[in-house]
C-alpha cells in the first residue's frame, strides 16, 4: 500500500504518501481551533506510470495510453485513497466543544 | 458537476472533463476488440484552486494551504469521479462475444 509504512521509508518518485504538517493559524489562517495547533495532514504526489497502484480500469488504460503516447497530457494522477478524521477542540463563547472533522488525514494514496 | 454538459461548453483551465478518444489498436496496441474500434474515454485535468469541486475536507484544506503557500508542492489533483462501462464485441475463434468492461469511460471529475 502507498502508506506511511511504505512511502516514508523509501525514496519514491512515483505516486506515494508525502509528509505534510499543517499549522492551523499559519498555514490556513484558522484561529478558531484551540487544540491541536496543527496536525499531520500528509498529501499524495508523484508519477503514475503503467501499473503503479492503478485504481480503475480507466486509470490503467490511461497509463498504458500515456506509455504509448508519452507526449500526451492525459495521465492518471496521484490522489488520496484512505482518509481518517481529526478530533479538535474549539470554543463557542466559553464553552469547550469537541468535534471530529472527517477526512482530514491522508493515510494512503492511489493513481486515479 | 464537472461533466461534459459543463466542461465541453466552457473554456475552463480549472479541473474539468476533457475529451479523449482512444483508438484501441493505435493507442493501446489492442487488436482483439472487433467493435468499437475506439471510444471516448475522456480524462480529467486542470487546476484545483480553493473550493473548486473539492471532494473531501482534506482536499479543501490542501487547496487553502496551497493558496496561502503557493510555492508548496502539495495541492489537490483533478481526477475522475463518475465512470461508466463500455460494451465491446470480440471473437473467440469465429464466435462473437459481447462483454462489458467496467469503469472505462469518465463522465465527471473532482478535485481530490
Amino acid at each position: 500500500a502507498l502508506d506511511a509504512a511504505y512511502c516514508f521509508r523509501n525514496v519514491q518518485d512515483n505516486c506515494c504518501l508525502r509528509p505534510l504538517y499543517i499549522d492551523f493559524k499559519r498555514d490556513l489562517g484558522w484561529k478558531w481551533i484551540h487544540e491541536p495547533k496543527g496536525y499531520n495532514a500528509n498529501f499524495c504526489a508523484g508519477a503514475c506510470p503503467y501499473l503503479w497502484s492503478s485504481d480503475t480500469q480507466h486509470s490503467r488504460v490511461l497509463s498504458l495510453y500515456n506509455t504509448i503516447n508519452p507526449e500526451a497530457s492525459a495521465s492518471p494522477c496521484c490522489v488520496s485513497q484512505d482518509l481518517e478524521p481529526l478530533t479538535i477542540l474549539y470554543y463557542i463563547g466559553k464553552t469547550p466543544k469537541i468535534e471530529q472533522l472527517s477526512n482530514m488525514i491522508v493515510k494512503s494514496c492511489k493513481c486515479s | 458537476a464537472l461533466d461534459a454538459a459543463y466542461c465541453f461548453r466552457n473554456v475552463q483551465d480549472n479541473c474539468c472533463l476533457r475529451p479523449l478518444y482512444i483508438d484501441f489498436k493505435r493507442d493501446l496496441g489492442w487488436k482483439w476488440i472487433h467493435e468499437p474500434k475506439g471510444y471516448n474515454a475522456n480524462f480529467c485535468a486542470g487546476a484545483c484552486p480553493y473550493l473548486w469541486s473539492s471532494d473531501t475536507q482534506h482536499s479543501r484544506v490542501l487547496s487553502l494551504y496551497n493558496t496561502i503557500n503557493p510555492e508548496a508542492s502539495a495541492s489537490p489533483c483533478c481526477v475522475s469521479q463518475d465512470l461508466e462501462p463500455l460494451t465491446i464485441l470480440y471473437y473467440i475463434g469465429k464466435t462473437p462475444k459481447i462483454e462489458q468492461l467496467s469503469n472505462m469511460i469518465v463522465k465527471s471529475c473532482k478535485c481530490s
Epitope: 502507498l2 519514491q12 512515483n14 497502484s53 492503478s54 | 482483439w32
Partner: antibody, heavy 118, light 107 residues
Amino acid sequence: QVQLVQSGAEVKKPGESLKISCKGSGYSFTRYYVAWVRQMPGKGLEWMGWIDPGTSNTRYSPSFQGQVTISADKSISTAYLQWSSLKASDTAMYYCARMLAWGWFDYWGQGTLVTVSS
Amino acid sequence: SYELTQPLSVSVALGQTARITCSGDNLGGYYAHWYQQKPGQAPVLVIYDKSDRPSGIPERFSGSNSGNTATLTISRAQAGDEADYYCASYDSSLMMVFGGGTKLTVL
C-alpha cells in the same frame, strides 16, 4: 472453457535445439499475453518472459534474454518457447500461462518437462 | 536484481488462520499476486490485484498490503490447503518477479 495445452515431455542432449508449444483455446488468443515460467527440479517459479500474440511484442527477464526465444502464431493460437543450443542446466518443467496486460496469470498450461542429459 | 522475500515454511493447525508474507521494495505500488501450487500440478491463481479472488477460490483466501509487505491470509485452514504458495509482482522496469515460495503445512 479456457485451456492452455502444452506439448509433451522432451528428452534432449546438450547442444541440441528444441521448440515447445502452448496452444490456447476457449478465449480470444490475441486479447491476452502468453508468459513462460521455468521451474527447476525442487525449486521455485521463475518468470522467463512473455509475448503479446496480437503484436508479437516480447519482453524477456534479464536472466533469460538471449538464452531462449519466445514466439507466437496467432493463426493457430499457439505460443512457442525455443532453444538453439540446450544445456544440462535447462532441465526443468516449463509452464505457459495466460496473462492480462494488468499482470497476473489466470490460467496455466499443464507444463512441459524438458530433460537435457548426455 | 529485484527480490521478493517469503518465509520458506509456515505451519498452521487445522481450522486456524495461516498468514504468508511477501516483502519487496516496490510492493507499495505494484500489486502482489498469489499462486498456489500442489505437488505435481501447475500453479493456480488465488489472489490478484492485491486482494481480489478469482471465481472458484474460497472466501477463506484473502490478500492485503501494508508498507512493502503483502500478506496472503488463509482462514479456517484445511488439509487441502497444503501446498507451496508464491507471490509475484514487478520490479521498476516492469519485469515480473516471483517470490521464493512458502511451503504451507496444515497440522
